[in-house]
């Protein structure tokens, strides 16, 4: 069950996000998430993962890129990029949208 919390050994990760108590956290794995909200600059958040490991396997899109790793402070120096948007000439038709 991907929603069940992991109860294995914990790893220490760099924590840089609006959800961090301090500069490090302890979790089942480390995460880096790059998110771009509509009309805003992308923001990169680092932290710990305990639930929803399936997010680690998601492919990057133009709005989000999710990276996971499993060793001490492994998320500290990771930088992510978002998938480039397709140029208009290559986009499929959007009739009726």
């Amino acid at each position: 069950d991907p929603v069940k919390p992991s109860r294995g050994p914990l790893v220490t990760c760099t924590c840089e996000s609006p959800h961090c108590k301090g500069p490090t956290c302890r979790g089942a794995w480390c995460t880096v998430v790059l998110v771009r909200e509509e009309g805003r600059h992308p923001q990169e958040h680092r932290g710990c993962g305990n639930l929803h490991r399936e997010l680690c396997r998601g492919r990057p899109t133009e709005f989000v890129n999710h990276y996971c790793c499993d060793s001490h402070l492994c998320n500290h120096n990771v930088s992510l990029v978002l998938e480039a948007t397709q140029p208009p000439s290559e986009q499929p038709g959007t009739d009726g949208q």
Epitope: V3, H19, P23, L51, H52
Partner: antibody, heavy 113, light 111 residues
């Protein structure tokens, strides 16, 4: 869009009980720790309690431990605060917050005889 | 009495730069991140600064945060009338195992 909507506030007599609810939407509720924070009329913010993502860890401010209980139902995307043995000094607006960024608009609890 | 100490009031004129201080201890500001919230009259608090000095998307760069030792400060440059609000600092406290807030600073924009 992240939304947190509190309900369950109202008028209660000293010694009475209330259960506050906070309905969350616009994000994966089960991925975030949640908090309750209160604000007495004309006063500052006071943290009440928090709960981790799966509900296995809870922390309370000392003055409310034993009287207040925080819980969550991830299947319903809802956070709760059960408040017992209420006192006049518990009168406040109670905010539900996603740690530590988004806040609901609050629900007013008034304890008076 | 709040665990984190803030001045009760601050003021400035439009265009000015104002700074609000927040003083704590080794168990909160000294070892954990500082957050700043803005509360406009009659509304819920809004996150302005997280992780000592980072702004969420949508918060103007007129707002900046800093931390040194067990103290922190919020600076607002190019002050505007809409900045008139209450400002709160917050941090996790390892000794209390809970979140602590400053008492709040009421910012008045003069003129």
């Amino acid at each position: 869009e992240v939304q947190l909507l509190e309900s369950g506030g109202g008028l209660v007599q000293p010694g009475g009980s209330l259960r506050l609810s906070c309905a969350a939407s616009g994000f994966t509720f089960s991925s975030y720790a949640m908090s309750w924070v209160r604000q007495a009329p004309g006063k500052g913010l006071e943290w009440v309690a928090n709960i981790n993502q799966d509900g296995s860890e809870k922390n309370y401010v000392d003055s409310m431990r034993g009287r207040f209980t925080i819980s969550r139902d991830n299947s319903k995307n809802t956070l709760y605060l059960q408040m017992n043995s209420l006192r006049a000094e518990d009168t406040a607006v109670y905010y539900c917050a996603r740690e530590f960024d988004y806040w609901g608009q609050g629900t007013l609890v008034t304890v008076t005889s | 009495q709040s665990v984190l100490a803030q001045p009760p009031s601050a003021s400035g004129t439009p265009g000015q730069r104002v700074t609000i201080s927040c003083s704590g201890s080794s168990s909160n500001i000294g070892s954990n991140y500082v957050y700043w919230y803005q509360q406009l009259p009659g509304t819920a608090p809004k996150l302005l600064i997280y992780g000592n000095n980072k702004r969420p998307s949508g918060v103007p760069d007129r707002f900046s945060g800093s931390k040194s030792g067990t103290s922190a400060s919020l600076a607002i440059s190019g002050l505007r009338s809409e900045d008139e609000a209450d400002y709160y600092c917050a941090a996790w406290d390892d000794s209390l195992n809970g979140r602590v807030f400053g008492g709040g600073t009421k910012l008045t924009v003069l003129g």
